[in-house]
Structure formats: structure tokens, C-alpha cells
């Protein structure tokens, strides 16, 4: 039960995270015009990974795409790449994790196969989340560097009569969406990896059979503690036959963690 819950929650958290990464990547407000300590402008500038926009005081908004590929800063290209890699890995991870979910039965797929798929999707989510966090952090670092450079420029080179007001940019909403989304995807991936441990059979899980001698009630349990750990591939309580030999599952009266699947 706990494994299923962990896996399901990991899937949902990752799904929300990846949706957030996609949203952040598409958003135009990666950087927004810094309004603090600046002349009051009748326009508001903001930029995304794919286009820059200007909202005029009338409410009219005009956006222009970055139609050049070679003319763009290498850092911006790197951020784009990181975000796209994050989305692709996350999307593949989601696809894999759907088939790995314990609550979804596909033919006679073994739990070991589901465990492997869960681990694979978990790792993909972790890498996806890290890519998003890295991408957003690189962009944020670029903004901070440019912010202080433009601040320095504002107070230098003003010997002439004509002044050019430097437009300074600060963190936009997309950065925060990206950080949160990346974090959620990362957390979801970790949860999937944890769930994988609960699904994976560590050794061959023999059926523990107790033989009832006529005078004594002595049980022979091969496999040591493994028979009762709940990590085995037995998901149903099965009678082997109606005689004296019973499965270990029947001997235990408390439910195992797989009883309610």
C-alpha cells in the first residue's frame, strides 16, 4: 500500500513539475524591467527565452520573436537547451512511469519489470528537475551580472548633455515557476526511486510452507526472514492445496503492504 502511494504521489508530483517546466519555458516573463529606482516609463519591457515583449501604458502589448539563432547569446542558447532537455526527459519519464504504476496492470508484467521502469522514470525525473533548476539558475545568474553592469553604466559616462537611460532587468515570474517546477520534478523523481525499492525483489522469494506433524506444530520456513518482509512477488494469498501445508501468507494474520492493490 505504502509503495503504491509513494509511486502514485511521485508520479503526480512529477507530472505537476513537468507541466510547470513546460509553462516556464513558454512564458515570456523570464526577465522583467526593473521599476525600482528607475525613471517612470510609459512602457514595460519583459523578455522570455523565445521573444521579447513591450506593454505600453494603453495596455497594447507587442512581442517580437528572436528570429536569429546564431546572433543569440550562448548563455541563452544553453538555457534553452537545458529546459528542452528537461522537458524531453520529463515527458519520457512520464510515459515510462505510467506503465510502471502498480495500479495499472499491463498483461503479465512482472513486478521486477515495474520496479526497473519505476527506477528509470525516477532517474529521468531527477535529471529533468536538475536540468530545469540549472537552466533557470544560469539565466538568473546572467540577469544578476547584467543588472550590476547596467547599474554601473547608469552612473558613468554622463558627461555629455544627452543621457541614455539603461533598461535594467530583474527576475521574472518564469524563474520562480521554473525553480518550483524543477524542485517538484526532482522530489517526484526521488519518490519514484524510493517506491522502486519497495517493488524490487531482492532475492528469489520461495513459498514458505509449514508442515504440520501429527503431534507437534513445527513450521519449516525456508528463506529466513525474506518470507515475511512483504517485498516478494506474491501479491495474492493462494492456497497450495487443502491439506496440512499452508502458505506463509496464510499463517500471518496481519495484512501485507500489497493486500489492497
Amino acid at each position: 500500500m505504502a509503495v503504491t502511494a509513494c509511486q502514485g504521489l511521485g508520479f503526480v508530483v512529477s507530472l505537476i513539475g513537468i507541466a510547470g517546466i513546460i509553462a516556464a519555458t513558454c512564458m515570456d516573463q523570464w526577465s522583467t524591467q526593473d521599476l525600482y529606482n528607475n525613471p517612470v516609463t510609459a512602457v514595460f519591457n519583459y523578455q522570455g527565452l523565445w521573444r521579447s515583449c513591450v506593454r505600453e501604458s494603453s495596455g497594447f502589448t507587442e512581442c517580437r520573436g528572436y528570429f536569429t539563432l546564431l546572433g543569440l547569446p550562448a548563455m541563452l542558447q544553453a538555457v534553452r537547451a537545458l529546459m528542452i532537455v528537461g522537458i524531453v526527459l520529463g515527458a519520457i519519464g512520464l510515459l515510462v512511469s505510467i506503465f510502471a504504476l502498480k495500479c495499472i496492470r499491463i498483461g503479465s508484467m512482472e513486478d521486477s519489470a515495474k520496479a526497473n521502469m519505476t527506477l528509470t522514470s525516477g532517474i529521468m525525473f531527477i535529471v529533468s528537475g536538475l536540468c530545469a533548476i540549472a537552466g533557470v539558475s544560469v539565466f538568473a545568474n546572467m540577469l544578476v551580472t547584467n543588472f550590476w553592469m547596467s547599474t554601473a553604466n547608469m552612473y558613468t559616462g554622463m558627461g555629455g548633455m544627452v543621457q541614455t537611460v539603461q533598461t535594467r532587468y530583474t527576475f521574472g515570474a518564469a524563474l520562480f515557476v521554473g525553480w518550483v517546477a524543477g524542485g517538484l520534478t526532482l522530489i517526484g523523481g526521488v519518490m519514484m526511486c524510493i517506491a522502486c525499492r519497495g517493488l524490487a525483489p531482492e532475492e528469489t522469494n520461495y513459498k514458505a510452507v509449514s508442515y504440520h506433524a501429527s503431534g507437534h506444530s513445527v513450521a519449516y520456513k525456508p528463506g529466513g526472514f525474506k518470507a515475511s518482509t512483504g517485498f516478494g512477488s506474491n501479491t495474492k494469498n493462494k492456497k497450495i492445496y487443502d491439506g496440512g501445508a499452508r502458505t506463509e501468507d496464510e499463517v500471518q494474520s496481519y495484512p501485507s503492504k500489497h493486500d489492497y492493490v
Epitope: Q33, P39, V40, T41, A42, V43, N45, Y46, Q47, S52, C53, V54, E56, S57, S58, G59, F60, E62, R64, V162, Q163, T164, V165, T167
Partner: antibody, heavy 120, light 113 residues
Framework: EVQLVESGGGLVQPGGSLRLSCAAS????????MHWVRQAPGKGLEWVSY????????YYVDKLKGRFTISRDNAKNSLYLQMNSLRAEDTAVYYC?????????????WGQGTLVTVSS | DIVMTQSPDSLAVSLGERATISCKSS????????????LAWYQQKPGQPPKLLIY???TRESGVPDRFIGSGSGTDFTLTISSLQAEDVAVYFC?????????FGAGTKVEIK
């Protein structure tokens, strides 16, 4: 046809108050920012104040802050300018103007103006 | 505040001749975000309110004759009337549309010689 009609001007004594109104028609008033601009007799144009379509943000020329208040009533398609502590130098024709959409913040339609005379 | 300096104060031109008005701003009116200039030109005839002629430094407002030509970028702008007509006698104002307060030039009076 876009129409802006100012009213409320007149003769007022120094230190007095006046409320100017601007009735708008021929366009969706609630979608546009509005300006007040004034022109002293025989002088140039002086921008006074701006109010956005949703009443925020609002901007004023620094020297009039605190004395003049711009407001609007979208339900009545009306723009207002409350002028307090009036001085002789406030004597001017007051125009209301529409902040044009997609015209780089220019003022695309103007009213005929209302004359405010501050004199004792 | 942005200071808009217009020159000349007045201009007398013969009918059919070219009239050129200059406007300089104390700060660049070029917005880096969209590489557009935020400067407008208005025409005011005696006893009338101003009328928008040019916005964005060079775009004519609809209904404005094509003899009115706006040019310039950054801090230096020009309004040219390519062939002056009798109905063009008026005062012309330039306006900063990028920074609040939105400031106007002092105006240039165009007359017929």
C-alpha cells in the same frame, strides 16, 4: 465617432477648488487610459495627469501632485480632475485626451477643452 | 523630467515649399525592448485642440496626408512638411511618450511666406 466633451471650467478665486469632467462617447471608455493636458493662454501644452483603464496606475506632473486628483467612472463613461488650492498660474484651457491603443502611447483624440480662470 | 527642445520657434515657408521642424530630447526616446522611438507630433490650429499627426517618430496617424513625414531616432527628431499647403498653417508640438511626465516641446509656429 469618438467624442470627448469637457465641462466644469469657469472663474474661480485663488485657493478655491474646481472639478472638471470629461464625458466620453463613441468608444469603449473602460478599455482606454485617459489624460488631462492643459494650455495656458498663448503658451504651449503641459501634460497634467494620466489614469489607466482600471484606475491604476495614476501619474501626475510633479508640481501638481497633492493639489490635483484624477479619477474616472467607467460606468458613467466619465473622467474627472479635482483641482484644489488653485493658483493664478493654473489658468489654462484643460483638455482631456485618450491614450491611443497601438500608437506608442500618443494621445489620439482630444476634447475641445474647458477654460479655467483663476483670478481674484 | 525629459526636456524637449524644438527649433525654430517660428517658420515662414512659401506654398509648395518644404518646411522642416527639429525636436531634441534630453534623453533617448528609443525603447531598447522593441527598438521603437516614443515620440509624437501634434498639429494645433488656432482655437482648436491638438491633433495627432505622427506617432512612434515616423508612423502617420490614419487620415494624415503623406506630405507629413516624421524621422529621427534616439534624441534627434524631425517633422517635414514636404509641400506646404495653406491648411498646414498651425503650431506643431513634439512630445515625449516614453517617460512620465509626458513632456511637450514649446511648439513651432508655421506660417506662409
Amino acid at each position: 465617432e469618438v467624442q470627448l466633451v469637457e465641462s466644469g471650467g469657469g472663474l474661480v478665486q485663488p485657493g478655491g477648488s474646481l472639478r472638471l469632467s470629461c464625458a466620453a462617447s463613441g468608444f469603449t471608455f473602460s478599455s482606454f487610459g485617459m489624460h488631462w493636458v492643459r494650455q495656458a493662454p498663448g503658451k504651449g501644452l503641459e501634460w497634467v495627469s494620466y489614469i489607466s483603464s482600471g484606475s491604476s496606475p495614476i501619474y501626475y506632473v510633479d508640481k501638481l501632485k497633492g493639489r490635483f486628483t484624477i479619477s474616472r467612472d467607467n460606468a458613467k463613461n466619465s473622467l474627472y480632475l479635482q483641482m484644489n488650492s488653485l493658483r493664478a498660474e493654473d489658468t489654462a484651457v484643460y483638455y482631456c485626451a485618450r491614450a491611443g491603443y497601438a500608437v506608442r502611447n500618443a494621445l489620439d483624440y482630444w476634447g475641445q477643452g474647458t477654460l479655467v480662470t483663476v483670478s481674484s | 523630467d525629459i526636456v524637449m527642445t524644438q527649433s525654430p520657434d517660428s517658420l515662414a515657408v512659401s506654398l509648395g515649399e518644404r518646411a522642416t521642424i527639429s525636436c531634441k530630447s534630453s534623453q533617448s526616446l528609443l525603447n531598447v525592448g522593441n527598438q521603437k522611438n516614443y515620440l509624437a507630433w501634434y498639429q494645433q490650429k488656432p482655437g482648436q485642440p491638438p491633433k495627432l499627426l505622427i506617432y512612434g517618430a515616423s508612423t502617420r496617424e490614419s487620415g494624415v496626408p503623406d506630405r507629413f513625414i516624421g524621422s529621427g531616432s534616439g534624441t534627434d527628431f524631425t517633422l517635414t512638411i514636404s509641400s506646404l499647403q495653406a491648411e498646414d498653417v498651425a503650431v506643431y508640438f513634439c512630445q515625449n511618450d516614453l517617460f512620465y511626465p509626458l513632456t511637450f516641446g514649446a511648439g513651432t509656429k508655421v506660417e506662409i511666406k
